[in-house]
């Protein structure tokens, strides 16, 4: 609060210099409906632990996911799922009808993502849920499933 | 590296006050693959030439394009394909599938888009791929089709 | 214009110390194409009224919208559109082509986004049209649907 | 190192539907691409198609209604299947790996492993 | 899919230098970095010798350079040998996630 005006520390110490960012990609093989991430990719001021990225930060942060499905159709149609979880709990998912036709195809392609812009505290956790992890194609799109956030204002 | 505290100058030199973005709609006539756009877009510290986006200040990018398609169904399945091109290189896709009943239909729209967040280098270009570019309909949708990149954090 | 180099005062005018976002989500009961939005969701820097998000900091925003829809396919295709519009006018849209086989199926669910990368002025409206809102499924998806806004860069 | 061997009948009749296997040793077929390549007799090499170990596919836009590709990762070999074969589908058939490399990009090293190829005539 | 074009045929004396051309369009050599060189000896399977326009797989001699300016690819052999008759064949990656060879090129030692 208040007005610091020509006060050059005081206005510095709300300036947003921290910043935090990752961008991860799907992990090669997925075995469950809770994915799991590539620990190379771009990691800075927040943790990656088992599937979940880790925030050391408070503040605002941008957060979004984007998967590729491939879904050798049945006969019947399917939905698929992703959902964005902070602290284990579903904040939004993103839903989509593919094979609607119920006929038996090669293949269908899907996209789906989904982005949440919420205020998180130190050591809060962000995963990724996705009910049908078998469309996730990692062999032929190993680059197109990821993960990223970045903190867009740090808490004054 | 290290701690400059009450050092201002030291402070001020760190702090992310370069800006760089780029908001480009898609060219009226397209005749390639190759994306190409309207040069009177959105455009700080970011360069426009031959269809690519070029770098001027290195440091960690987001990069968003969304396209929407307008396809007249043939009496099979389309795979709509979005490529985010790096230096010449495919740096992640978006591909949907569409008129999957088979059934030629009127027309089906579909919107597709792909994200990237990246450390780019000066004089690095993103460029736009798609397979399906007649499909792309510039006379209804001048608008929609977009590339975009803004600087999150720029090198120190 | 002109380089301050080593003037901090003048320096630190320029930064983009000020910051403004927004993250609404879309109001239980909808009963017209312009969609409204929850006040009690995250705002700083941005006023909400009548559906409506409006600007007091002028600059360059990132502004995002994403809908997810719950259609009841009719025997005929269903088009979902959302737009995005500035003070009134249509800035951006996205459709997606639903029930495209024509025949009527339980339930399909699609997923539909929209950004823009935009300067805006002091008083500029950000509002979201949808022509079919009836498919926006407010008791299954009360987190899914969100409009969101933030400031990227001041103007100097 | 990694080795390919294809095998399959060396005369098919018309019409009929040529079936060719390549057998991969030295290496796992679910860690790569792998992709079909004919040759007519004095002719040009001419792409046909490519497999996933997942499954994926993609085909030569041109013979994209006759070829049918399926990996079988617990023998280690790709299959290709082209129907409605004429006396055109005359050639020497290759398997080969189509070596993808995503790191920071995706890398195309092209294809980097050929078997020796197997004649296939087509005739009554 | 349209073949890229090449030279029928190029020929040159031991020692000399030679380039074989490859021109494709906007939806495969001009768009990706992706093309590669084969050398094919009669009778034999193709062996890669450049990827990526101008990358060398370890084993190939130093002999053998790529490069690309828009829709055309090049493949340059300096000193040339006897052993490097063979037809030579290039390859692009296409738009519609395909590959799309040249319709090759005879090269003669004279």
């Known amino acids: 609060g208040g007005n610091c005006s020509e006060d050059l520390l005081c206005i510095l110490k709300r300036a947003p210099f921290k910043k935090s960012w990752a961008y991860l990609q799907v992990a090669k093989h997925l075995n469950k409906t809770k994915l799991s991430w590539n620990k190379d990719g771009i990691l800075h001021g927040v943790r990656y632990q088992d599937g979940n990225l880790v925030i050391q930060f408070p503040g605002l942060y941008f957060i979004i996911c984007q998967l590729q499905f491939l879904v050798q159709c049945p006969n019947n149609s399917v939905d698929l799922k992703l959902e964005l979880l902070i602290n284990k709990h579903i904040k939004k998912q993103a839903l989509v009808t593919v094979c609607e036709s119920g006929m038996q195809t090669k293949h269908v392609y899907q996209n789906l993502s989904q982005f949440l812009l919420d205020y998180l505290q130190v050591n809060t956790t962000v995963s990724v849920n996705v009910d049908t992890f078998q469309y996730i194609d990692t062999s032929t799109f190993p680059l197109e499933n990821v993960l990223s956030v970045f903190l867009y204002s740090n808490s004054d | 590296g290290g701690n400059c505290s009450e050092d201002l100058l030291c402070i001020l030199k760190r702090a992310p006050f370069k800006k760089s973005w780029a908001y480009l709609q898609v060219a009226k006539h397209l005749n390639k693959t190759k994306l190409s756009w309207n040069k009177d877009g959105i455009l700080h510290g970011v360069r426009y030439q031959d269809g690519n986006l070029v770098i001027q200040f290195p440091g960690l990018y987001f990069i968003i394009c969304q396209l929407q398609f307008l396809v007249q169904c043939p009496n099979n399945s389309v795979d709509l394909k979005l490529e985010l091109l790096i230096n010449k290189h495919i740096k992640k896709q978006a591909l949907v599938t569409v008129c999957e009943s088979g059934m030629q239909t009127k027309h089906v729209y579909q919107n597709l888009s792909q994200f990237l967040l990246d450390y780019l280098q000066v004089n690095t270009t993103v460029s736009v791929n798609v397979d399906t570019f007649q499909y792309i309909d510039t006379s209804t949708f001048p608008l929609e089709n977009v590339l975009s990149v803004f600087l999150y954090s720029n090198s120190d | 214009g002109g380089n301050c180099s080593e003037d901090l005062l003048c320096i630190l005018k320029r930064a983009p110390f000020k910051k403004s976002w927004a993250y609404l989500q879309v109001a239980k009961h909808l009963n017209k194409t312009k969609l409204s939005w929850n006040k009690d969701g995250i705002l700083h820097g941005v006023r909400y009224q009548d559906g409506n998000l409006v600007i007091q900091f002028p600059g360059l925003y990132f502004i995002i919208c994403q809908l997810q829809f719950l259609v009841q396919c009719p025997n005929n295709s269903v088009d979902l559109k959302l737009e995005l519009l500035i003070n009134k006018h249509i800035k951006k849209q996205a459709l997606v082509t639903v029930c495209e086989s024509g025949m009527q199926t339980k339930h399909v669910y699609q997923n539909l986004s929209q950004f823009l990368l935009d300067y805006l002025q002091v008083n500029t409206t950000v509002s979201v049209n949808v022509d079919t809102f009836q498919y926006i499924d407010t008791s299954t998806f009360p987190l899914e649907n969100v409009l969101s806004v933030f400031l990227y860069s001041n103007s100097d | 190192q990694v080795q390919l061997q294809e095998s399959g009948p060396g005369l098919v009749k018309p019409s009929e539907t040529l079936s060719l296997t390549c057998t991969v040793s030295g290496g796992s077929i679910s860690s790569y691409i792998w992709s079909w390549i004919r040759q007519p007799a004095g002719k040009g090499l001419e792409w046909i198609g490519r497999?996933?170990?997942?499954?994926?596919?993609n085909y030569n836009p041109s013979l994209k209604s006759r070829v049918t590709m399926s990996v079988d990762t617990s023998k280690n070999q790709f299959s290709l299947k082209l129907s409605s074969m004429t006396a055109a589908d005359t050639a020497v058939y290759y398997c080969?790996?189509?070596?993808?490399?995503?790191?920071?990009?995706?890398?195309?090293?092209?294809?980097?492993?050929w078997g020796q190829g197997t004649t296939v005539t087509v005739s009554s | 899919q349209s073949a890229l074009t090449q030279p029928a045929s190029v020929s040159g004396s031991p020692g000399q230098s030679i380039t074989i051309s490859c021109t494709g369009t906007?939806?495969?050599?001009?768009?990706?970095?992706?093309v590669s060189w084969y050398q094919q000896h009669p009778g034999k399977a193709p062996k890669l010798m450049i990827y990526?326009?101008?990358n060398r797989p370890s084993g190939v001699s130093n002999r053998f350079s790529g490069s690309k300016s828009g829709n055309t690819a090049s493949l340059t052999i300096s000193g040339l040998q006897t052993e490097d008759e063979a037809d030579y064949y290039c390859s692009s990656y296409t738009s519609r996630s395909t590959w799309v060879f040249g319709g090759g090129t005879k090269l003669t030692v004279l």
């Open positions: 906007s939806s495969d050599v001009g768009v990706y970095d992706y």
């Open positions: 497999i996933y170990a997942s499954g994926n596919t």
């Open positions: 080969a790996r189509d070596y993808r490399v995503a790191g920071t990009y995706y890398y195309y090293y092209g294809l980097d492993v």
């Open positions: 990526e326009v101008s």
